[in-house]
Interface confidence: low
């Protein structure tokens, strides 16, 4: 299709070489009130959607993204050619930074409902460059923690080296939705709740004598609790004896709950005690079976191909540990009568 009629937006992504930060492009199809590009029914004031990006289409996932090769080749479908770029509804997620992401990205509705819609598209010219400004070497992180129940703030990384007084007007989005009341380079949170977690985008406009462009940064905000003061507890096995059938296979599961730790380094392992000897058993990898803000439940199984008489004399011990301390639970096998 002819992209010469697309509205154009210029964006700058200045990435920190220090972090695996992400980036997003919204399909900012022009609002019908403001542009001749998209032919749509007018919205009454009450109907203005909270999604500023992509005002045009009723179905937010109904968008096609392309990249325009710099050599003039035909447009390429993003989904086929770029595994590190993921389309989620009307948003394009860049999973890894790098100057190779620079280029022109075009979005348009998949379904064209009238002849006027042919020109309903947006061309985004994205410039990507590493952060070189030494004076802002220690800008805000692209991953920020907020402690639940406390006050906190979310800083726009590209503006965190400027004072509030110098800062330009900032447009903030959370999970793609416009936060219309936020205009400064920092969002102040009076009390942190778990719903404050999410992907925040901050935009501001920069210009020179020739043109203007949008500077964008993406911040992953994680709400956390304080580090646990407790050692992990074993939820299973509860009993210290287990009835088994000789000659049959057996799986014993060890499930343990670990409280939140900023640096999470859980240990869960099985070892066997036989009279004076004890040794660690090679067992399948541990797996997380439930994860919440406050804790994580991890499971690790010991598998016996067949229970032998010798196993009845042994103790099977599950050992779990975090930075606070360790807990053990032993199981003695008993033949079913």
């Amino acid at each position: 299709f002819n992209i010469s009629g697309c509205s154009t937006k210029k964006l700058l992504w200045t990435y920190s070489t220090r972090s695996e930060e992400e980036f997003v492009l919204f399909c900012d199809l022009p609002e019908p009130q403001k542009s001749h590009f998209c032919h749509r029914n007018r919205l009454s004031p009450k109907q203005v959607p909270e999604h500023l990006p992509f005002m045009g289409s009723n179905d937010l996932s109904d968008v096609q993204w392309y990249q325009q090769p710099s050599n003039g080749d035909p447009l390429e479908d993003i989904r086929k050619s770029y595994p590190h770029i993921i389309q989620d509804k009307c948003t394009l997620h860049f999973l890894t930074p790098g100057v190779n992401n620079s280029g022109s990205y075009i979005c348009r509705p998949k379904m064209i409902k009238s002849p006027y819609d042919v020109a309903c598209c947006v061309k985004m010219i994205l410039e990507v460059k590493p952060q070189t400004n030494a004076s802002c070497e220690y800008s805000a992180s692209h991953k920020q923690d907020l402690l639940l129940g406390s006050t906190g703030s979310i800083s726009c990384p590209s503006l965190s080296c400027q004072s509030d007084a110098q800062s330009p007007a900032v447009t903030w989005y959370k999970n793609g939705k416009l936060l219309s009341v936020e205009r400064s380079n920092r969002i102040v949170v009076d009390e942190v709740y778990d719903y404050h977690q999410g992907t925040y985008v901050c935009d501001y406009t920069q210009s020179d004598t020739v043109s203007s462009w949008t500077v964008r940064a993406v911040v992953q905000v994680r709400t956390i609790v304080g580090d646990t003061k407790l050692k992990p507890d074993i939820l299973d096995p509860v009993e210290d004896t287990l009835e088994v059938e000789l000659g049959k296979p057996l799986t014993i599961s060890c499930k343990a709950r670990f409280g939140f730790e900023r640096v999470f380094n859980p240990v869960i392992k099985w070892y066997i005690k036989d009279s004076d000897l004890e040794w660690e058993v090679s067992v399948p990898e541990a797996k997380s079976i439930k994860s919440t803000l406050k804790d994580e439940i991890i499971e690790r199984n010991i598998i016996l191909e067949k229970v032998t008489q010798r196993d009845l004399r042994r103790k099977f011990v599950c050992f779990v540990q975090n930075s606070i301390g360790n807990t053990t639970q032993s199981v003695q096998l008993k033949e079913k009568r």
């Epitope: 220690y138 992180s141 406390s150």
Partner: antibody, heavy 124, light 107 residues
Framework: QVQLQQSGPGLVKPSETLSLTCTVS????????WSWIRQPPGKGLEWIGY???????NYNPSLKSRVTISVDTSKNQFSLKLSSVTAADTAVYYC??????????????????WGQGTTVTVSS | AIQLTQSPSSLSASVGDRVTITCRAS??????LAWYQQKPGKAPKFLIY???SLESGVPSRFSGSGSGTDFTLTISSLQPEDFATYYC?????????FGQGTRLEIK
């Protein structure tokens, strides 16, 4: 640019409490973890503990019974108190910012901004 | 606590030399290791994180490698400003610990 300015006495008497303050300028204390580290004369570095802007702390077990780290977000500063000092606590004390470097599924922390260091001598 | 042992404790080298410093952890720490440079009377400066990722602005002659328990810091061609003490640091579990340091001096 974030800078850390340390203040506090350079001489402390045995059995007294060592008190140091670190003031953060050029950026907010919010959303970061802040550490204290010390270095005895001619020796290596020893981590004392950290504080999150909200007040959550974690201390080195070897010093835990004597250490208190506190934060004052309104003044953009955090402080170290070490009680019952002896000559073995003579060292250069540093404050530092712990920054979370983002790997996709985890955080990797390093101390990327340091204070200038304060030489504290414990002597009567 | 996880112990980090650096070797050698000190070494002499000339400008242009290739130098390798090793750091061994008392237990596996994945790649949660950083390297710092400290000059006399100054605070440490952070060079490498995640065992091998170079901090922005650090010259490319510095490189790190390793995983688990054995790690190395290599300076491919020593420059006059590289003579300093180097420390490794683990952030895999608390308490955070540092190696005892390796002093690099001019031959």
């Amino acid at each position: 640019q974030v800078q850390l300015q340390q203040s506090g006495p350079g001489l402390v008497k045995p059995s007294e409490t060592l008190s140091l303050t670190c003031t953060v300028s050029g950026g907010s204390i919010n959303n970061y973890y802040w550490s204290w580290i010390r270095q005895p004369p001619g020796k290596g570095l020893e981590w004392i503990g950290y504080i999150f802007y909200s007040g959550t702390t974690n201390y080195n077990p070897s010093l835990k019974s004597r250490v208190t780290i506190s934060v004052d977000t309104s003044k953009n500063q955090f402080s170290l108190k070490l009680s019952s000092v002896t000559a073995a606590d003579t060292a250069v004390y540093y404050c530092a910012r712990d920054v979370g470097i983002a790997a996709r599924n985890s955080y990797y922390y390093v101390m990327d901004v340091w204070g200038q260091g304060t030489t504290v001598t414990v002597s009567s | 606590a996880i112990q980090l042992t650096q070797s050698p404790s000190s070494l002499s080298a000339s400008v242009g030399d290739r130098v390798t410093i090793t750091c061994r952890a008392s237990q596996g720490i994945s790649s949660a290791l950083a390297w710092y440079q400290q000059k006399p009377g100054k605070a440490p400066k952070f060079l490498i994180y995640d065992a091998s990722s170079l901090e922005s602005g650090v010259p490319s002659r510095f490189s790190g490698s390793g995983s688990g328990t054995d790690f190395t810091l290599t300076i491919s061609s020593l420059q006059p400003e590289d003579f300093a003490t180097y420390y490794c640091q683990q952030f895999n579990s608390y308490p955070i610990t540092f190696g005892q340091g390796t002093r690099l001096e001019i031959k």
